[in-house]
């Protein structure tokens, strides 16, 4: 790399992928291994992200751009720029400090991540339960009982003893 000749700032001519090296009379030097500069005129190179352990490299670091990580199978990204990987659970479960646990009765989770959420309370909207909830699925609300014409069938709520919403283990 040639010595820069800018009268204003000799570092301004250093391109991306290099830094202006004060130890070498402000010569543009290439970024060292595992570092990068995404813009010109930099006096220091940024540190490349490393994707190790549960992290998997989605995009390699180059001299001008940072690496990007995602998570290995069985894990999903959390946090800014996938700064963390969290264990997947099955649908109908949530991750606790003790591992994956089934959703409690009355709650569901239809994803492999996140927490169990309460079933929708159909009666709050003046509606009835059309399809019962499970650990994996929310209830489906139907028209209010008053909206049903005579003779029309509606789903009868199951007996409490059967713990509705829990699908067979």
């Amino acid at each position: 790399f040639e010595r820069t000749r800018s009268l204003q700032d000799p570092c301004s001519n250093c391109p991306a992928g290099t830094f202006c090296d004060n130890n070498r009379n402000q010569i543009c030097s290439p970024c060292p291994p595992n570092s990068f500069s995404s813009a010109g005129g930099q006096r220091t190179c940024d540190i490349c992200r490393q994707c190790k352990g549960v992290f998997r490299t989605r995009k390699e670091c180059s001299s001008t751009s940072n690496a990007e990580c995602d998570c290995t199978p069985g894990f999903h990204c959390l946090g800014a720029g996938c700064s963390m990987c969290e264990q997947d659970c099955k649908q109908g479960q949530e991750l606790t400090k003790k591992g994956c646990k089934d959703c409690c009765f009355g709650t569901f989770n239809d994803q492999k991540r996140g927490i169990c959420r309460p079933w929708t309370n159909c009666s709050l909207d003046g509606k009835s339960v059309l399809v019962n909830g499970t650990k994996e699925r929310d209830v489906v609300c139907g028209p209010s009982p008053a909206d049903l014409s005579p003779g029309a069938s509606s789903v009868t709520p199951p007996a409490p003893a059967r713990e509705p919403g829990h699908s067979p283990q």
Epitope: D46, I47, C48, R49, Q50, G79, A80
Partner: antibody, heavy 118, light 112 residues
Framework: SLEESGGDLVKPGASLTLTCTAS?????????ICWVRQAPGKGLEWIAC????????TYYASWAKGRFTISKTSSTTVTLQMTSLTAADTATYFC????????????WGQGTLVTVSS | ALVMTQTPASVSAAVGGTVTINCQAS??????LAWYQQKPGQPPKLLIF???DLASGVPSRFKGSGSGTEFTLTISGVQCDDAATYYC??????????????FGGGTEVVVK
Amino acid sequence: SLEESGGDLVKPGASLTLTCTASGFSFSSNYWICWVRQAPGKGLEWIACIYVGSSGDTYYASWAKGRFTISKTSSTTVTLQMTSLTAADTATYFCARDSSSYYMFNLWGQGTLVTVSS
Amino acid sequence: ALVMTQTPASVSAAVGGTVTINCQASEDIDTYLAWYQQKPGQPPKLLIFYASDLASGVPSRFKGSGSGTEFTLTISGVQCDDAATYYCQGGYYTSSADTRGAFGGGTEVVVK
């Protein structure tokens, strides 16, 4: 570069907001901007970080939670709000930049001095 | 919480000599460790990242090594300009409820 401002002499119990201003790069890039402090004659102590990309995730040292708040206030500024200050908070406060996600700071400001005294 | 223990607190070296500074992490941090140099009235300067990678513009007489819980910074062919306090720092983002990041207590290097 990074430049801190807002340091002052304040009384115990007071609040103070410090500002970290970037020049030569934009906070729209995927960086973490963090605050680190250093009491006179003592070592370095990490306070908090904020991801200045889209999500704005924040992380705090356990002792800083509740009393310190880090925020991105513009495309070139990050602030640190401090409340209920005590003499133990007297220090030079630095902002620093991390691109690795592992608390490795390749760019630092010169620091701003906060003195808490009655 | 992650704790970084740095030894010795102070070390003296002759010009041209070698200085070794040790840093121990309270838990396995892989190679997520950085070394900084700080001179009075100045901010820290990054020397080494990922335990052994040299930062831009740092002379090759600085060498970092180690992984897991034991790390070392070695300065070979010490120069007068190396008189400063050196800090190790380990850490990583884990979760919003449990974030780890810590500096060692520092090692003052005196050059005779």
